[in-house]
């Protein structure tokens, strides 16, 4: 039995897979901050995790995915306010009993040192210094991302 949050993540991923490929971003849009090959956008209001997930998709983006500890540190360096928490695209999958990114991959246990419990209705937030497990219903800010790397157009052989 999938939770509503898991269903939401899966639906968004499936709709992404169905969309036709668009040319990739060469530069970050106005208001977005570049961090290596990503563009990041920090919210100025608060929402529970699933609303944050949905709001990023209105910007043709996703909640932040963090590849490794190095990317986490670079992201945290952009956070100016000490006590502010931000949702990222990672939540607890009850069916798989593991932390799952919204792109469907599982958390490598070495990547993030999470403070708090891994349990149902838990989602991950980051601050300037730490990574926390919070109830997904907690209302905090969030970070959206767009990938900067250009997507090559698919070349189809002549029929």
């Amino acid at each position: 039995q999938k939770s509503s949050i898991e269903k939401c993540s899966v639906d968004i991923q499936q709709s992404r897979n169905k969309t036709t490929e668009r040319p990739g971003l060469l530069n970050c849009p106005i208001y977005w901050q570049q961090l290596r090959e990503k563009c990041l956008l920090f919210s100025h209001t608060v929402n529970p995790w699933n609303n944050s997930l949905a709001d990023c998709s209105t910007k043709e983006s996703s909640l932040l995915l963090i590849r490794d500890k190095d990317e986490l540190i670079h992201t945290q360096n952009l956070i100016r306010d000490k006590a502010i928490l931000f949702w990222i695209g990672l939540n607890f999958s009850l069916s798989e009993k593991n932390w799952k990114w919204i792109n469907g991959s599982f958390l490598n246990s070495n990547d993030l040192e999470i403070r708090g419990d891994a349990k149902e209705n838990s989602c991950i937030s980051i601050s300037q210094t730490s990574v926390y497990s919070e109830y997904c219903s907690t209302e905090i800010r969030w970070i959206c991302q767009k990938e900067l790397t250009p997507v090559r157009n698919k070349v189809y052989p002549d029929s």
């Epitope: 100025h44 608060v46 929402n47 609303n51 100016r80």
Partner: antibody, heavy 120, light 107 residues
């Protein structure tokens, strides 16, 4: 057109509480975050905090955290700001102000202001 | 807390002349700066966001510039309705702070 209409002036004694309302019209009330900003006589502007009318989630300026409560009633498209344990230096005009974008911190529409006078 | 310092406190200008208002931030705020106009007895009115982007319906005589710690609001040719107090605001941090204001008065 977007309109934010606030409640009338209030006179309060030190130690009392005041609750100011802000009725929104001309747009989807739950679609925009509401902020509260105050202006003491002859002074600049001071941001107090915000409420997401869609969910009721709040975030307050630490300076007011222990004394302010922001709420909303979506059925009547109204936001409220309550400030307790009033002091004379809380005498100010209090404004509700709509956040123009979820991802930027500017205020694109303001209420007309509510004058709160704290005097013994 | 980021302190926004506006200068001058008062600017006396004749109608038709150019007015240049300054706003300095105590730390780098990028371009996350807003300008508002406030007339006596009225609420502030949004003029410019992101340091230089005019809000809908704002006349072209208003322009903003700057990044980092130094910002400028320029009114190219003052009209009678432009005499007011102008405030800058930063949102680089989530504790939004405003400058003390510049009053533009008729010379």
């Amino acid at each position: 057109q977007v309109q934010l209409v606030q409640s009338g002036a209030e006179v309060k004694k030190p130690g009392a509480s005041v609750k100011v309302s802000c009725k929104a019209s001309g747009y989807s009330f739950t679609g925009y975050t509401m902020n509260w900003v105050r202006q003491a006589p002859g002074q600049g502007l001071e941001w107090m905090g915000l409420i997401n009318p869609n969910t009721g989630g709040t975030y307050y300026n630490q300076k007011f955290k222990d004394r302010v409560t922001m709420t909303r009633d979506t059925s009547i498209s109204t936001a409220y700001m309550e400030l307790s344990r009033l002091r004379s230096d809380d005498t100010a005009v209090y404004y509700c102000a709509r956040l123009g974008d979820n991802y930027r911190g500017y205020f694109d529409s303001w209420g007309q202001g509510t004058t709160v006078t704290v005097s013994s | 807390e980021i302190v926004m310092t506006q200068s001058p406190a008062t600017l006396s200008v004749s109608p038709g002349e150019r007015a240049t208002l300054s706003c300095k931030a105590s730390q780098d705020v990028g371009t996350a700066v807003v300008w508002y106009q406030q007339k006596p007895g009225q609420a502030p009115r949004l003029l410019i966001d992101w340091a230089s982007i005019r809000h809908t319906g704002i006349p072209a005589r208003f322009s903003g510039s700057g990044s980092g710690t130094e910002f400028t609001l320029t009114i190219s040719s003052l009209q009678s309705e432009d005499f007011a107090v102008y405030y800058c605001q930063q949102y680089s941090t989530y504790l939004y702070t405003f400058g003390g204001g510049t009053k533009v008065e008729i010379k």
